[in-house]
Interface confidence: low
């Protein structure tokens, strides 16, 4: 699986996942959320050569064509495949609230 | 929906179906499907802007973020939706065989 | 003021069951969750779970889950830790403790004694 | 799971500045809060959300967090200050979390 154990620890060109954290103030510009302050989001990329992890028949028909005509501007992406909730603390006025925002968590990548 | 009925239609840079026909032999090298000779699988390309057809919230989550970090790497992809199966005819000797391949035909897209 | 009271000291015996409250007063009870914190003798303190008394939405630690149960009866503004079967091993001081957010406890009880020993 | 790493103990001189830390992955991106326990007592809450002090906690007591770690730092410290302190965070799945605890001494 393209997940954290895999592509934490190789250096790896094509489709895997990436770490990244966002701070939800800074990078997206939210105030709402109180807790927490950011979370590990992480994301996908890197490229999707012929049968690298791929999604559906369709991907590995893009991918193979692709490697045979690498001009064409078809070819597949590396997205997210496994997501996880984050559970997060707003207030609506003096009242917290507790809210589980799904799949706001990347854990694992494919080629689609 | 980002399908053949809107997209078709619109000139969009943003996400969207695009055509694509396939000639198995000439595309792809496969000699071993005899009917179709091709097939209309189509493809999805274009630019995920914030909320342009979001599959996900963490897609949300990164399209914001792209908007406010555009120097980023982590930005999210436009790729199939819906799929829809094609049936082929090929042989194994003289004996026809007729099989239906699954998620073959990309019918619409979306930011992932 | 705000304060939360707990109910009084408790010896056991194992596989006995208990349930030990925190009675919330000087605050609107139902707008606050409620945490648990156990500190067994000379160790750290270890967090529970929660509960919110208006929802009586909870959350346990994996620690902790499946070994007690927290609920609230808003009524009275009361939060509950309740064990079914006692172990030598809940032996410990329990906190309950007003949480404003994660890892934020403004005020505590002042605690429960559980002594659990044949 | 996630774990928050203390010193068991720290020493500090009367009137001199003690610093107690808390380690933890990424423990900059979270909120960061410090209790004081005294023996026999219920814990205290002195610092919460990184740096700010409840009304009634001396302005000796003060707060840091980036990085990996958060930062107590008590100035002109005070044999009343002895006591054992908390950090408390929690990880991105919201559960909470307590440091191990840190026995501060006050020397003299």
């Known amino acids: 699986a393209l997940d954290a154990a895999y592509c934490f620890r190789n250096v790896q060109d094509n489709c895997c996942l990436r770490p990244l954290y966002i701070d939800f103030k800074r990078d997206l510009g939210w105030k709402w959320i109180h807790e927490p302050k950011g979370y590990n989001a992480n994301f996908c990329a890197g490229a999707c050569p012929y049968l690298w992890s791929s999604d559906t028949q369709h991907t590995k028909v893009l991918s193979l064509y692709n490697t045979i005509n690498p001009e064409a501007s078809a070819s597949p992406c590396c997205v997210s495949q496994d997501l996880e909730p984050l559970t997060i603390l707003y207030y609506i006025g003096n009242t917290p609230k507790i809210e589980q925002l799904s799949n706001m968590i990347v854990k694992s990548c494919k080629c689609s | 929906a980002l399908d053949a009925a809107y997209c078709f239609r619109n000139v969009q840079d943003n996400c969207c179906l695009r055509p694509l026909y396939i000639d198995f032999k000439r595309d792809l090298g496969w000699k071993w499907i005899h009917e179709p000779k091709g097939y209309n699988a189509n493809f999805c390309a274009g630019a995920c802007p914030y909320l342009w057809s979001s599959d996900t919230q963490h897609t949300k989550v990164l399209s914001l973020y792209n908007t406010i970090n555009p120097e980023a790497s982590a930005s999210p992809c436009c790729v199939s939706q819906d799929l829809e199966p094609l049936t082929i005819l090929y042989y194994i000797g003289n004996t026809p065989k007729i099989e239906q391949l699954s998620n073959m035909i990309v019918k619409s897209c979306k930011c992932s | 003021q705000v304060q939360l009271v707990q109910s009084g000291a408790e010896v056991k015996k194992p596989g006995e069951s208990l349930k030990i409250s925190c009675k919330g007063s000087?605050?609107?009870?139902?707008?606050?969750?409620v945490a648990w914190v156990r500190q067994m003798p000379g160790k750290g303190l270890e967090w529970m779970g929660w509960?919110?008394?208006?929802?009586?939405?909870?959350r346990y630690s994996p620690s902790f889950q499946g070994q007690v149960t927290i609920s609230a009866d808003k009524s009275i503004s009361t939060a509950y830790l309740q064990w079914s079967s006692l172990k030598a091993s809940d032996t410990a001081m329990y906190y309950c403790a007003r949480m404003l957010a994660w890892g934020w406890f403004d005020y505590w009880g002042q605690g429960t004694l559980v002594t659990v020993s044949s | 799971s996630y774990e928050l790493t203390q010193p068991l103990s720290v020493s500090v001189a009367l009137g001199q500045t003690a610093r107690i830390t808390c380690s933890g992955d990424?423990?900059?991106?979270?909120?960061a809060h410090w209790y004081q326990q005294k023996p026999g007592q219920a814990p205290v809450l002195v610092i919460y959300?990184?740096?700010d002090r409840p009304s009634g906690i001396p302005e000796r007591f003060s707060g840091s967090n980036s990085g990996n770690t958060a930062t107590l730092t008590i100035s002109r410290a005070q044999a009343g200050d002895e006591a054992d302190y908390y950090c408390?965070?929690?990880?991105?799945?919201?559960?909470?979390?307590f440091g191990g605890g840190t026995k501060l001494t006050v020397l003299g």
């Open positions: 959300d990184k740096s």
């Open positions: 408390a965070s929690y990880d991105s799945s919201l559960m909470m979390v």
């Open positions: 990424n423990l900059g991106g979270y909120y």
């Open positions: 509960i919110d008394p208006g929802q009586s939405n909870t």
């Open positions: 000087g605050y609107s009870f139902t707008r606050y969750y």
